[in-house]
């Protein structure tokens, strides 16, 4: 249903990384505008992005209230300049999004190696604990705060002179690995949520190598 001069939104897609969550859709509007509503399965609808000509709406503020809830959004189409107009059924045209559960589905952002420190034949590699937009008691939580032990990091490390990538894993943000004395190593990390079946891994962090500024070397 709907008025002849509006078309329903389609290809509603959730784009979410570290809980920053945007709903995208098509088509680019021609003589029409959109309003988005979002709700949990059991909650009331809340309107966002009123009468917009954009084809995306940032819903982060809503989903971070409870990242373990399942959300549904819908996009309403209205004729431009006549937003009171409704479809033939007495309501504006709308399309539903797929369901979205942030905790299970948000993509893991690219991690960053914060530092590495060599002491003799041991290297301590620290991963930056990235801040999210999820809040508790008015403070922003880190990725580790939100996911706890569900989040692990895989470290890939290799001698600068070698192609084989050794691995280590941690459910904290720190690795302590054994290295050969006098060898330079490179490092890259990947965030993983092993309990997931999709969106399990982040992209790899930028590679950091010993002998560059980020690290520290101490001979004992």
């Amino acid at each position: 249903s709907g008025t002849t001069n509006t078309v329903a939104a389609y290809n509603l897609t959730w784009k979410s990384t570290n809980f920053k969550t945007i709903l995208e859709w098509e088509p680019k509007p021609v003589n029409q505008v959109y309003t988005v509503q979002i709700s949990t399965k059991s909650g009331d609808w809340k309107s966002k992005c009123f009468y917009t000509t954009d084809t995306e709406c940032d819903l982060t503020d809503e989903i971070v209230k409870d990242v373990k809830q399942t959300y549904l959004a819908r996009v309403f189409s209205y004729p431009a300049g006549n937003v009171e107009s409704t479809g033939s059924a007495g309501e504006p045209l709308y399309e539903n999004s797929p369901e979205f559960t942030p905790y299970l589905e948000t993509n893991l952002g690219q991690p960053t190696i914060q530092s590495f420190e060599q002491v003799g034949t041991k290297v301590n590699v620290t991963v930056e604990d990235e801040r999210t937009l999820v809040r508790r008691n008015n403070t922003f939580l880190s990725l580790r705060d939100v996911f706890g032990k569900d989040l692990i990091y895989t470290l890939y490390y290799w001698k600068s002179s070698s192609s084989g990538k050794k691995t280590a894993k941690t459910n904290t943000n720190e690795f302590l690995i054994d290295v050969d004395k006098g060898e330079n190593y490179c490092f890259s990390v990947q965030a993983v949520i092993p309990s997931r079946t999709v969106n399990r891994k982040s992209t790899d962090s930028p590679v950091e190598c010993m002998g560059q500024e980020k690290g520290e070397f101490r001979e004992i």
Epitope: I152, Y156, G164, A168, P194, R200
Partner: antibody, heavy 120, light 107 residues
Framework: EVQLVESGGGLVQPGGSSRLSCAAS????????IHWVRQAPGKGLEWVGY????????DYADSVKGRFTISADTSKNTAYLQMNSLRAEDTAVYYC?????????????WGQGTLVTVSS | DIQMTQSPSSLSASVGDRVTITCRAS??????VAWYQQKPGKAPKLLIY???FLYSGVPSRFSGSRSGTDFTLTISSLQPEDFATYYC?????????FGQGTKVEIK
Amino acid sequence: EVQLVESGGGLVQPGGSSRLSCAASGFTIYDYIIHWVRQAPGKGLEWVGYIDPSNGYTDYADSVKGRFTISADTSKNTAYLQMNSLRAEDTAVYYCARDIQSVSGEFDYWGQGTLVTVSS
Amino acid sequence: DIQMTQSPSSLSASVGDRVTITCRASQDVNTAVAWYQQKPGKAPKLLIYSASFLYSGVPSRFSGSRSGTDFTLTISSLQPEDFATYYCQQHYTTPPTFGQGTKVEIK
């Protein structure tokens, strides 16, 4: 249902080559790490190497380094083990296994195995 | 490389017996140890992960524990289908290494 199916085994001459395939279904290999593990007749399990299909990273046991190469084709959801310069001591059942990348690094699913016999 | 020393290499037991298999890591591996069961002509099957967690679908008579670098697999009451070879594995770091295996045979 998660499944790993190896193929490509058989009799190979010493010094020869063989390519094994590990076809995955029920999950996408991009999201996991795939290992190859072998077992010589009547012997224990020996790790051969791994690939992370999301970045192409690999590593190998010292016993096969320089002779074996692991690759993956994510569009076919398949991992491969290319074995060159084969020796009699490479005779074994070769398994591929899925690593869920948990902290303990367990292999939760294994293929049925394929026998590679290196003999003249 | 981290060595996993498994003992005994074989044991004979009867149905209903309590069976214990141990593995010692040559260095600290935290809890990054798994146990597998393998029957002749078959692929290994995961029993225990993270030293003490029972994998889904595995009977509760199997359990795992850790004390420092010593790891134990216990079968509380051996069943006919439990006669097999058992392997421990560490994957704290690459390369993952396996114990030599313990063959559990019928007495």
